[in-house]
């Protein structure tokens, strides 16, 4: 590895991973790179290896225990370091004081379904992926349609300001293919983001009846 | 590389005072954070402070706390312990370290630093 500009960005999903992604301008692909969690109240450490994404930023995920424990609180702060391979010793790249519940990104919802569908309207479901009971209720949503003839990037986004995991979608037209996304996002953490987006959910609105206006 | 150069040790009495310095050279361009640590006899090596090149961040052991200051000078080449209120407890050789990680913790180790100075002997009387 050379000098270069470094980057290092984890999230915690809220139960039991922290993904990361570190970026340095200038290192060499074949380096062997690993992040090391250590927190400060708990008796476990974790690794994983760093693997390339594209030319110059590497990513893993530590896999603190089962998908739904509740690895880590509020109050848990865990030390994270690159550690890359030279010659016969680990050299340390980066490093940060994690704070977890600061650092959220949950994972996309999943078992989306449509609930019922007409012409014009649609209602669609779905489920939140271990998410942490911490949240209680203070969770919200993203959802975007997409239309014929459009991209994902041109679709309107509708906000959620609260823990609904369903949505009526209204005004669409009549014997039409969409496709809908949904995310999630905590409003706890000064640097938490979005989830990414859902697997698209396809759906089409049922034919106007006919002889009826549309 | 980088070379570091302690100076500033020797004997004092418990209650007083003494200033390291350490000196880097070399492609101190490279570094980021620049600490001190301590080895005392048949104990393993110690945690003293820490400092960002800066000089926006500081972090000390917890066994120095409010005793110990670190600093640097203005051209960021030399880092200074400033050590009062010493005790026996505190005889040990101390090390200057340079670390290029990118980052701040207040949990350093001696994992995080790859260079070193060769130390120098504090000595504290009671």
């Known amino acids: 590895a050379v000098n270069g500009t470094s980057q290092f960005t984890c999230f915690y999903n809220s139960r039991a991973n922290i993904s990361c992604v570190w970026s340095q301008d200038g290192a060499l692909q074949d380096t062997s790179c690993q992040v090391h969690a250590w927190p400060d109240r708990r008796r476990w450490n974790q690794t994983c290896e760093l693997l390339p994404v594209s030319q110059a930023s590497w990513a893993c995920n530590l896999i603190l225990g089962a998908p739904d424990s509740q690895k880590l609180t509020t109050v848990d702060i865990v030390t994270l370091r690159v550690l890359c391979r030279e010659g016969v010793r680990w050299r340390v790249m980066a490093i940060q004081d994690f704070k977890p519940f600061e650092n959220l990104r949950l994972m996309a919802p999943i078992s989306l379904q449509v609930v019922h569908v007409e012409t014009h309207r649609c209602n669609i479901s779905w489920e939140i992926s271990q998410a942490s009971h911490y949240f209680e209720r203070h969770l919200e949503f993203e959802a975007r349609t997409l239309s014929p003839g459009h991209t994902w990037e041109e679709a309107p986004l509708l906000t959620l300001k609260q823990k609904q995991e369903w949505i009526c979608l209204e005004t669409l037209t009549p014997d039409t293919q969409y496709e809908f996304q949904v995310r999630v996002k905590p409003l706890q953490g000064e640097f938490t983001t979005w989830s990414p987006w859902s697997q698209p959910l396809a759906f089409r609105t049922k034919p106007a009846a006919l002889g009826k206006d549309t | 590389q980088v070379q570091l150069v302690e100076s500033g040790g020797g004997l004092v009495q418990a209650g007083g005072s003494l200033r390291l310095s350490c000196a880097a050279s070399?492609?101190?361009?490279?570094?980021?954070?620049m600490g001190w640590f301590r080895q005392a006899p048949g104990k393993e090596r110690e945690f003293v402070a820490a400092?960002?090149?800066?000089?926006?961040?500081?972090t000390y052991g917890d066994s120095v706390k409010g005793r110990f200051t670190i600093s640097t000078n203005n051209a960021k080449t030399t880092v200074y312990l400033q050590m009062n209120s010493l005790k026996p407890d505190d005889t040990a050789v101390y090390s200057c370290?340079?670390?290029?990680?990118?980052?701040?913790?207040?949990?350093?180790?001696?994992?995080?630093?790859?260079?070193w100075g060769q130390g120098t002997q504090v000595t504290v009387s009671s």
């Open positions: 070399g492609s101190i361009f490279s570094l980021n954070t």
């Open positions: 370290a340079a670390s290029a990680a990118v980052g701040w913790t207040t949990r350093w180790s001696t994992i995080d630093f790859d260079s």
């Open positions: 400092i960002s090149r800066s000089g926006g961040s500081a």
